[in-house]
């Protein structure tokens, strides 16, 4: 159950990040708002009415709304996480699970040609699960992961656009490129 | 007022089965998150499931995927299936409320759990 | 697992005296502990919750303190029915524990 109800969120590598909780609006019925993550098997942070809000470590601030904020996430941030929220007499009143991955954002993409045999190259150098696409004059051509090698050969001039992507950032590269007739390095 | 009746409890050989039942009444028993706990003969007293008002499951280590903790909250009832039992398993098993998710502040009568051969 | 440690395992005092029982965690828990009274033939009833709170019912007499690892439950004038096994439990991490119980004597 932990799992399937689980709401999937992204952060990324070295960003804060916060796990706000949909759907919750805070009252004077809450007295508990507990973090716990999973794989730690512990409460991470807990506030509780009239009482100091406890934190594991600086690294974590509640808000008074209940969102949790993870700062300068680190690779092993990345977990299930599970709130749960109590009325003044105990009673459970909302859990939610959040499964939070973690990516490192993606670099500049990088454009490189050859006007020897017309070959243009785009290469991401950095980040998790990137997503290249290259576009020739506004029309796509390839899509691929790290890099893309593309000959062209509808004219020596155009403008290429290279995107990089994951699900914490996006880069994208504009390039002119310009061919002599000969075909001149 | 709040009460918890648990029963079910018996005598088993090793490898056995039993379904302990808690029968909840005085208290809103689909809003709480409830407990089995058990008692050594002993006397060391040592938590052993949970399952929280919106259905989440939690185990100790020595009983996971041999115990199962379950609840109907349309009849108020909660129960632990316990399957391939061992003789470390003998104890009092006793149903409690989870206040907060936390501290037991109601707790059944207890029943007994024996597994010897 | 979070091991809670009790001492001593017996007390024995005097009616009227003040007692005081330890309960100490492996790694520091907050404020997330929990004392119980089990008489000889009963249940286990919450006494104090997150170490220094009061529970409903309870008399006066019995109060809580402490934070991070170490933990006292204190009884400030002790009468004859609270002759009982106490127990702590923390609730900071899964699985729950309990301490191995401190039994209280009357002279």
């Known amino acids: 159950k932990e799992i399937t109800n689980a709401l999937e969120t992204w952060g990324a590598l070295g960003q804060d990040i916060n796990l706000d909780i949909p759907s919750f609006q805070m009252s004077d019925d809450i007295d508990d708002i507990k973090w716990e993550k999973t794989s730690d098997k512990k409460k991470i942070a807990q506030f509780r009415k009239e009482k100091e809000t406890f934190k594991e470590k600086d690294t974590y601030k509640l808000f008074k709304n209940g969102t949790l904020k993870i700062k300068h996430l680190k690779t092993d941030d990345q977990d299930i996480y599970k709130v749960s929220i109590y009325d003044t007499k105990g009673k459970n009143v909302l859990e939610k699970i959040f499964d939070l991955k973690i990516q490192e954002r993606v670099s500049k993409p990088k454009i490189s040609w050859t006007c020897i045999n017309t070959t243009l190259t785009c290469e991401v150098m950095n980040g998790t699960d990137p997503e290249l696409n290259l576009y020739q004059d506004g029309k796509h051509l390839k899509l691929s992961q790290r890099v893309i090698t593309h000959k062209w050969t509808t004219s020596l001039s155009a403008k290429f656009k290279c995107t990089a992507g994951n699900k914490v950032s996006k880069e994208s590269s504009v390039e002119p490129v310009s061919c002599p007739e000969k075909g001149l390095d | 007022e709040v009460k918890l009746v648990e029963s079910g409890g018996g005598l088993v050989k090793p490898g056995g089965s039993l379904k302990l039942s808690c029968a909840a009444s005085?208290?809103?028993?689909?809003?709480?998150?409830m407990s089995w706990v058990r008692q050594t003969p002993e006397k060391r007293l040592e938590w052993v499931a949970s399952?929280?008002?919106?259905?989440?499951?939690y185990y100790l280590d020595s009983v996971k995927g041999r115990f199962t903790i379950s609840r109907d909250n349309a009849r108020n009832i909660l129960y632990l299936h316990m399957t391939s039992l061992r003789s470390e398993d003998t104890a009092m098993y006793y149903c409690?409320?989870?206040?907060?998710?936390?501290?037991?502040?109601?707790w059944g009568q207890g029943t007994s759990v024996t597994v010897s051969s | 697992d979070i091991l809670l440690t009790q001492s001593p395992a017996i007390l024995s005092v005097s009616p009227g005296e003040r007692v005081s029982f330890s309960c100490r965690a492996s790694q520091r828990i907050g404020t997330s502990i929990h004392w119980y009274q089990q008489r000889t033939t009963g249940s286990p009833r919450l006494l104090i919750k997150y170490a220094s709170e009061s529970i409903s019912g309870i008399p006066s007499r019995f109060s809580g303190s402490g934070s991070g690892t170490d933990f006292t439950l204190s009884i400030n004038s002790v009468e004859s029915e609270d002759v009982a096994d106490y127990y702590c439990q923390q609730s900071h991490g899964w699985p729950f524990t309990f301490g191995g119980g401190t039994k209280l004597e009357i002279e």
């Open positions: 409690a409320r989870s206040s907060y998710g936390e501290l037991m502040d109601y």
């Open positions: 399952i929280s008002g919106g259905g989440f499951l």
């Open positions: 005085g208290f809103t028993f689909s809003s709480y998150d």
